[in-house]
Amino acid sequence: MNGRVDYLVTEEEINLTRGPSGLGFNIVGGTDQQYVSNDSGIYVSRIKENGAAALDGRLQEGDKILSVNGQDLKNLLHQDAVDLFRNAGYAVSLRVQHRLQVQNGPIGHRGEGDPSGIPIFMVLVPVFALTMVAAWAFMRYRQQL
């Protein structure tokens, strides 16, 4: 990806109930499988159609999973992270970080890239300023007519 990619970062607690075929998603990442450069975190790489996560609707591909049932996912080997999900029980609480791309392309979830986020006011202030300038220019133009 060329240029800078900026994200709005939000966190959410997602409570899933394990379905007949499990939780219904795939993960990448871990200290031995860095999916995002300089980040050994655990990311959602696939949501299984009609699985528990898909039916709940909140977990998205590209989300970073911070903890499972309160257990931090930092500094885990990939397979250890997989095993943590497998042994998480029937009711599973996920602390999830959503990253929404806000510049440098269409808005959407991203599975890879710069994991850092920017505050929403950094986006809104320039938009507001541009709107004010446009309104002022429009008023000046009307006065000249």
Epitope: S21, G22, N26, I27, V28, Q33, K48, H78, Q79
Partner: nanobody
């Protein structure tokens, strides 16, 4: 998107061997779960085996005869088929999913895979 291209199929006598290859695109190939499936005329698609981050597994019908391996440097997965039988005749497909399932060690359901190759014909006479 991930592209998968199988090769290595052909006609072989019973008791013979073949090695199928599946070349994949994508810079995160090492994270892929890769499966082999086969489909004989008039039959449903059948799981042959899979290889994940942690290991590989094959179906009972081919255990001891077929092995799966991968070369992450070449973005390629292999299916080594020995002691071939006429009932192994089928179109063989390579399939991929990004990442590891949190639900199953070795996914055998075709619905667990998002990307599929075009298939390569194996005929055992």
């Amino acid at each position: 998107d991930v592209q998968l291209v199988e090769s290595g199929g052909g006609l072989v006598q019973a008791g013979g061997s073949l090695r199928l290859s599946c070349a994949a695109s994508g810079r995160t190939f090492s994270t892929y779960t890769l499966g082999w499936f086969r489909q004989a005329p008039g039959k449903e698609r059948e799981f042959v085996g899979t290889i994940t981050w942690s290991g590989s597994s094959t179906a009972d019908s081919v255990k001891g005869r077929f092995t799966i391996s991968r070369d992450n440097a070449k973005n390629t997965v292999y299916l080594q088929m020995n002691s071939l039988k006429p009932e192994d005749t089928a179109v063989y497909y390579c399939a991929a999913a990004i990442g590891s399932s949190v639900d199953s060690d070795y996914p055998s359901d075709p619905l667990e895979y998002d990307y599929w190759g075009q298939g390569t014909q194996v005929t055992v006479s």
